[in-house]
Interface confidence: low
């Protein structure tokens, strides 16, 4: 029986060009976490495997950093990063737990100001 629950940072927002930490925490279970997958709408971002450590997807290696803990840091954010992110905890013997985070990347007011008054 799966007794655990996933706590996440929920709905979060960040400025374009900045960075954000995605965090999930599995509680209320004694199951062993064997692997955590971080995915964004069916794209694999990163994996933290209990045996093999962190692996970052080659397409994201320049903008994704492991940690803190089992979390994930997204850097150099763009508006295209807006959307749902999932932390998928593979555990033994419970099975799989999934948490959801919605990230909204906002245009920076400084960036807007700079672009509007940029001298050619």
């Amino acid at each position: 029986m799966m007794t655990g629950t996933i706590e996440t940072t929920g709905n979060i927002s960040a400025e374009k060009g900045g960075s954000i930490i995605l965090q999930c925490h599995l509680s209320s279970t004694t199951a062993q976490v064997t692997q955590v997958n971080w995915e964004q709408q069916d794209q694999l971002l990163a994996i933290c495997n209990a045996d093999l450590g962190w692996h970052i997807s080659p397409s994201f290696k320049d903008r994704v950093a492991p940690g803190p803990g089992l979390g994930l840091t997204l850097q150099s954010l763009t508006v295209n990063d807006t959307g749902e992110y999932f932390c998928i905890y593979h555990t033994y013997p419970d099975g799989t737990y999934t948490g959801r985070i919605f990230l909204e990347v906002l245009e920076s007011s400084v960036a807007e100001h700079g672009a509007r008054f940029q001298i050619p």
Partner: nanobody, 125 residues
């Protein structure tokens, strides 16, 4: 830390067979996929075969129908049965481990960051 040790390489005549083994140690949970790669003299490393979640397997076109990958979880060992060997199969064969992800069972080496030291297979008459 996971450690992989290959064995079973050697000299074999064309048309002959060999079975490579890869023993895994130092793991806690065993939740990972495994694959075989090879590197011929003067060439880059290429994927040969992988065994992924649910026991799914994949093979490169050059070995399909001749090589068979298998895994004995009780013995923590990966195998590669190589039949109908050809001179072009001559290479150092490496086994490698990668995280388990059900959406991916390809032979790209980019996810494989834990490697054995390799075992040499020479096919020659």
């Amino acid at each position: 830390e996971v450690q992989l040790v290959e064995s079973g390489g050697g000299l074999v005549q064309p048309g002959g067979s060999l079975r490579l083994s890869c023993a895994a140690s130092g793991y806690k949970y065993g939740v990972y996929s495994m694959g075989w790669f090879r590197q011929a003299p003067g060439k880059g490393r290429e994927g040969v075969s992988a065994i992924c979640s649910g026991g799914r397997t994949t093979y490169s076109d050059s070995v399909k129908g001749r090589f068979t990958i298998s895994r004995d979880n009780a013995k923590n060992t990966l195998y590669l049965q190589m039949n109908s060997l050809r001179p072009e199969d001559t290479a150092v064969y490496y086994c490698a481990a990668r995280p388990l992800w059900t959406g991916d069972c390809d032979l790209s080496s980019s996810w494989y960051k834990t490697w054995g030291q390799g075992t040499l297979v020479t096919v020659s008459s």
